[in-house]
């Protein structure tokens, strides 16, 4: 597709006469008809196969024709064609006199013709104008012409369609010969393939736009070169996707069971001793003078219960003060103003005089204590049971009820459930506060890894087109990592080719 352009420059008809020799009255109001057709060795009448165009009246007798519009017409004249330019042509230019305003052929007398020229030859597509001048006995016409391609058409014959685009079907501009020139960041025959971020992993990454790196399932990182561990994997790593290999001190399928909180987090402060008391659990044993779950707070004096004989402790700016009950006095309410005559001993305690009756002492029966036998013995107040054991008062004695995994008088001994290697098929054993847990290798499950659950899901080579197969251990299924150009759960479908273009 292209345009044959004809630029009329000057027409000379000094005598103002028609082709018949008769003069125009009052002068020759001149317009032109142009016929463009296929090459003929001898230009003859007949259909204008490449097109026709007429001008309005451009002048009288002799005149120069201005570029651009002139009296509603256009100069250069445009003769568009929508076929491959053959490289040869025939051109007929007729100058006519218009007695009135109607320029239609049927409205003009046959002798209104002023002059007629006919040329033929070869003409290549190009921007340069070919200048020509045709002279008859009475007239002279100077003009130039050329053939150029329409928008989006390129090549020697204007036969190559190329429309610049920047969309899903391509990202390019057109070179002068009609070939595609990809926009920055795009490649491929039709510039449809983005150039991914430099370094983006060839197999594990892809992109939908330039300088991007999108990761295929199981991979992450800026360049998609880091595997994604099993979903929920907390303190573990992977070397291929969906693995969860536990870091030291962590256990469980998701490596989320902290088997050594004390070492990992050092929660106890101010020199306290930390004891692991189960998964994600710990106990701090404070040094004297400190309190709080983590021994993080200094102890106020009243917290040590310094007041005796039922005295109440009040914190003061400079320490503490004991408010003593009736019958007692002293810094810690340790002195009594009572005697045995006042029957001060409770709960069947026996009273003994001291200092010639100025003082007394109570001898308490079992299970009671205090200077007046007023307190029931709670042998658990010192919390003697270690590792979360429960202290139970049993009359005059006490006993510790140990949590699973611990034994000894004070639950101080740790029983390792893993000592007897209970996990089958190479399972890894972890001691937990409530027993043990087995982390099973691929293909096995059950509390002791005794159940064979499946074989390797990738063993049957389910992925097509040289895709990489990964086994998801949690579901015993496979994931196919497709190479470029293939999609589908098994990489079985080739990516659709771009739609065909008309060249």
């Amino acid at each position: 597709s292209g345009v044959f352009q004809l630029q009329l420059q000057e027409f000379i008809n000094e005598r103002g006469v028609l082709a018949s020799g008769r003069p125009c009255e009052p002068g020759c109001r001149t317009f032109f008809r142009v016929c463009l057709k296929h090459f003929q060795a001898v230009v003859s009448p007949g259909p204008c196969t490449f097109g026709t165009v007429s001008t309005p009246v451009l002048g009288t007798n002799s005149f120069a024709v201005r570029d651009d519009s002139s009296g509603g017409g256009r100069n250069p004249l445009q003769l568009p064609f929508n076929f491959t330019w053959p490289g040869t042509f025939s051109l007929i230019i007729e100058a006519w006199h218009a007695p009135g305003d109607d320029l239609r052929p049927e409205a003009l007398p046959p002798d209104a013709l002023i002059s007629k020229i006919a040329i033929q030859g070869s003409l290549a597509v190009g921007q340069n104008w070919l200048l020509d001048e045709q002279t008859s006995t009475l007239t002279r016409l100077r003009y130039s012409y050329r053939v150029i391609c329409s928008d989006n058409y390129y090549g020697d014959n204007c036969s190559r369609l190329c429309k610049k685009r920047n969309d899903h079907f391509g990202h390019y501009v057109c070179q002068p010969d009609g070939n595609l020139s990809c926009l920055p960041g795009w490649t491929g025959e039709y510039c449809q393939q983005p150039i991914c971020l430099s370094g983006c992993h060839e197999q594990n990454g892809y992109c939908s736009k330039p300088a991007e790196c999108l990761c295929r399932p199981g991979w992450q990182g800026r360049l998609c070169n880091e595997c994604i561990p099993h979903n929920g994997c907390r303190h573990g790593t992977c070397s291929t996707p969906w693995q969860c290999t536990c870091d030291e001190g962590w256990g469980g399928l998701f490596c989320d069971q902290d088997l050594n909180y004390c070492t990992h987090h050092s929660p106890c402060k101010n020199g306290a001793t930390c004891s692991n008391s189960g998964q994600r659990s710990y106990t701090c044993t404070c040094r004297p003078g400190y309190t709080g779950v983590d021994c993080e707070l200094e102890l106020s004096e009243c917290d040590s219960n310094p007041c005796r004989n039922g005295g109440s402790c009040k914190d003061q700016e400079d320490g503490y003060h004991c408010l003593c009950p009736p019958g007692y006095y002293g810094l810690h309410c340790e002195h009594s103003t009572l005697s045995c005559a006042d029957s001060p001993c409770f709960n069947g305690g026996s009273c003994r005089e001291r200092n010639q009756g100025a003082n007394y002492a109570c001898e308490c029966p079992p299970n009671f204590t205090g200077s007046n036998c007023e307190k029931k013995v709670d042998r658990c107040t010192s919390n003697p049971c270690a590792n979360g054991g429960q202290c139970l008062n049993r009359g005059p004695s006490r006993m510790c009820r140990c949590r699973p995994g611990f034994t000894g008088t004070y639950c101080e001994l740790h029983v390792s459930d893993c000592a007897r290697n209970p996990c089958a098929h190479g399972g890894t054993c972890h001691d937990l506060e409530n027993g043990l847990m087995c982390t099973c290798p691929a293909g096995f499950s059950g509390r002791r890894c005794e159940v064979r659950t499946s074989i390797d899901a990738c063993a049957s080579s389910p992925c097509f087109n040289r895709a990489t197969c990964y086994t998801d251990l949690s579901t015993d299924t496979f994931v196919c990592n497709c190479p470029y150009g293939f999609v589908g759960s098994r990489c079985e479908f080739p990516v659709g080719l771009p739609p065909s273009f008309p060249w």
Epitope: R280, V293, L297, S300
Partner: antibody, heavy 119, light 108 residues
């Protein structure tokens, strides 16, 4: 961004139990060494620290309130709660939950709940 | 318990001026475990300073804390209208954790 949202009744009868809940959003209540704390402010007065709970469920209370206070944790709902028994008019206050990092400065607070003890 | 006494109870200043708030402890506070809070009406307190002198996240450098042992100071330079509110100090060195009674900063 971690936020604390409090819920619970604004009116409690004397001798009954005051119960408030603090829901943690934007983070896990079981993460790190945070002290999840309750603090109260009597009308027109200063602030009083009640106590705290850690992710492990271990608690520590203000000795003056220890006998009446229980703080508990519900990790499945990502929230912690305050129960205070045998309340009197002296327990009328705005109650706040707060988060303290490794030491007890309180960097994030709940919106506060005004609790009135009245029959 | 450690008693914290703040002074003055009320401080009247104009915007642009410098405010100096004091907090005195009944006993020495270990590790400078002292914090400052601002509390606007109807809102929860907001942490300004911890460790006596470290600014909390998002607090402008007009706020600064200093002091050690028993005497601590909060200084606010170039007061703005949003700064007028009650301020509390808090110790977290000894059990029980305690707060000062507060200083009310008001517009003169």
């Amino acid at each position: 961004e971690v936020q604390l949202v409090q819920s619970g009744p604004g009116l409690v009868k004397p001798s009954q139990t005051l119960s408030l809940t603090c829901t943690v959003s934007g983070g896990s209540i079981t993460s790190g060494g945070y002290y999840w704390t309750w603090i109260r402010q009597h009308p027109g007065k200063g602030l009083e620290w009640i106590g705290y709970i850690k992710f492990s469920g271990n608690t520590y209370y203000n000795p003056s309130l220890r006998s009446r206070v229980t703080i508990s944790l519900d990790t499945s709902k990502n929230q912690f709660s305050l129960n205070m028994t045998s309340v009197t008019a002296a327990d009328t206050a705005v109650y706040y939950c707060a988060r303290a990092p490794g030491s007890h400065n309180f960097d994030i607070w709940g919106q506060g709940t005004m609790v009135t003890v009245s029959s | 318990a450690i008693r914290l006494t703040q002074s003055p109870d009320t401080l009247s200043l104009s915007p642009g001026e410098r405010a100096t708030l004091s907090c005195r402890a009944s006993v020495s506070i270990s590790n400078n475990y002292l914090a400052w809070y601002q509390q606007k009406p109807g809102q929860a307190p907001r942490l300004l300073i911890y460790g006596a002198s470290s600014r909390a996240t998002g607090i402008p450098d007009r706020f600064s804390g200093s002091g050690s042992g028993t005497d601590f100071t909060l200084t606010i330079r170039r007061l703005e209208s949003a700064d007028f509110a009650p301020y509390y100090c808090q110790q977290y060195s000894r059990s029980p954790i305690t707060f000062g009674q507060g200083t009310r900063l008001e517009i003169k």
